[in-house]
Interface confidence: low
Amino acid sequence: FERTRSLQDPCSNCPAGTFCDNNRNQICSPCPPNSFSSAGGQRTCDICRQCKGVFRTRKECSSTSNAECDCTPGFHCLGAGCSMCEQDCKQGQELTKKGCKDCCFGTFNDQKRGICRPWTNCSLDGKSVLVNGTKERDVVCGPSPADLSPGASSVTPPAPAREPGHSPQ
């Protein structure tokens, strides 16, 4: 089948990194600078993606593969193939229509992107709060008081918070 196809279509012999140049009797010509073809048999080369402005180059374009971009400091990627860069906030904040807002009490965000999420409710799993939560960090749940029989653990649990997962700020 491949042989038949190549007899019918000379362009099928052109490898990745080249294009089938109709202007030159269907000779396989190398992709020009700043272009690529990732598969064989292509009649044109695609223009390389340019990582400009807030986009920066993660992988340079080659004759057989497109450039890959990520975002400069202060931004993070969104969308397939980092099609957009969205502004960062700080840990303990989320991006809202009024700028970067601190996480509300009882919520946290340990990244520079995304939204604030509620602290884990340790009591739902029958556990106690081992380390209180902050705007930047979730609570750490420890074993339930019943699990802490004398000698079973060297960790002394803190006094339970008034509301599970909450810490004074």
């Epitope: 400009k52 402005g53 807030v54 986009f55 400091p73 202060g74 931004f75 957009m84 860069c85 969205e86 502004q87 960062d88 906030c89 700080k90 904040q93 991006l95 229509k97 009024k98 700028g99 970067c100 807002k101 601190d102 520079k112």
Partner: antibody, heavy 112, light 110 residues
Framework: VEESGGRLVKPDESLTLTCTAS????????MTWVRQAPGKGLEYIGF?????DTSYASWSKGRFTISKASTTVDLKISSLTTEDTATYFC???????????WGPGTLVTVSS | AQVLTQTPSPVSAAVGGTVTINCQSS????????LSWYQQKPGQPPKRLIY???DLASGVPSRFKGSGSGTQFTLTISDLECDDAATYYC??????????FGGGTEVEFK
């Protein structure tokens, strides 16, 4: 927000403009500098984000530097020319939702 | 370089009437919607009216309406008041996160 530092300067001199933020934290907002020549439109210079990273318009790269401290954002302009004569505005906000709060502006006049 | 072209300028209006200001971009704005509208009066800083192409900024009357996507955007001001006499600017964000202002459209009253 309020801008300060605008004055009459000679060509080739440098000047630093300061934007003072009150009533909000610069750790929560991006800040931008924009200028407006007499009788002309608004021209974007650049911004600084919550982490201190900066971005500039292609024409302003090199001669303009934006930096910030806890409550102030500075715009340093070097090698001033008469074309830099303008009112310089400082704005609060971000790219996503636009700039929602502006200072009254400070006038820079470049003349020999 | 990206260019935002505003038409018409100036625009002459009547109190109680409606004006439409167009803003055409030389290429699609970021996410097809990262476009804001600002109002500026002489001797004053800009005031944000619309963001994300059609979202009304807080404190702005609903007489101001933004629409459009990609490269074509419109600001419509209805039930015009004398206080609306000003210059209006569109401003777009692009995929390289550059920010560009349009040339401005002056709204004056007959």
């Amino acid at each position: 927000v309020e801008e300060s530092g605008g004055r009459l300067v000679k060509p080739d001199e440098s000047l630093t403009l300061t934007c003072t933020a009150s009533g909000f934290s610069l750790s929560h907002y991006w800040m931008t500098w924009v200028r407006q020549a007499p009788g002309k439109g608004l021209e974007y210079i650049g911004f600084i984000n919550v982490g201190g990273d900066t971005s500039y318009a292609s024409w302003s790269k090199g001669r303009f530097t934006i930096s910030k401290a806890s409550t102030t954002v500075d715009l340093k302009i070097s090698s001033l020319t008469t074309e830099d004569t303008a009112t310089y505005f400082c704005g609060r906000g971000g790219l996503t939702f636009g700039w929602d709060l502006w200072g009254p502006g400070t006038l820079v006049t470049v003349s020999s | 370089a990206q260019v935002l072209t505003q038409t018409p300028s100036p625009v002459s209006a009547a109190v109680g009437g409606t004006v439409t200001i167009n803003c055409q971009s030389s290429q699609s704005v970021y996410s097809n919607s990262f476009l804001s509208w600002y109002q500026q009066k002489p001797g004053q800083p800009p005031k944000r009216l619309i963001y994300s192409a059609s979202d009304l900024a807080s404190g702005v009357p609903s007489r101001f309406k933004g629409s459009g996507s990609g490269t074509q955007f419109t600001l419509t001001i209805s039930d015009l008041e004398c206080d609306d006499a000003a210059t209006y600017y569109c401003a777009g964000v692009y995929s390289d996160n550059t920010y560009v202002f349009g040339g401005g459209t002056e709204v004056e009253f007959k």
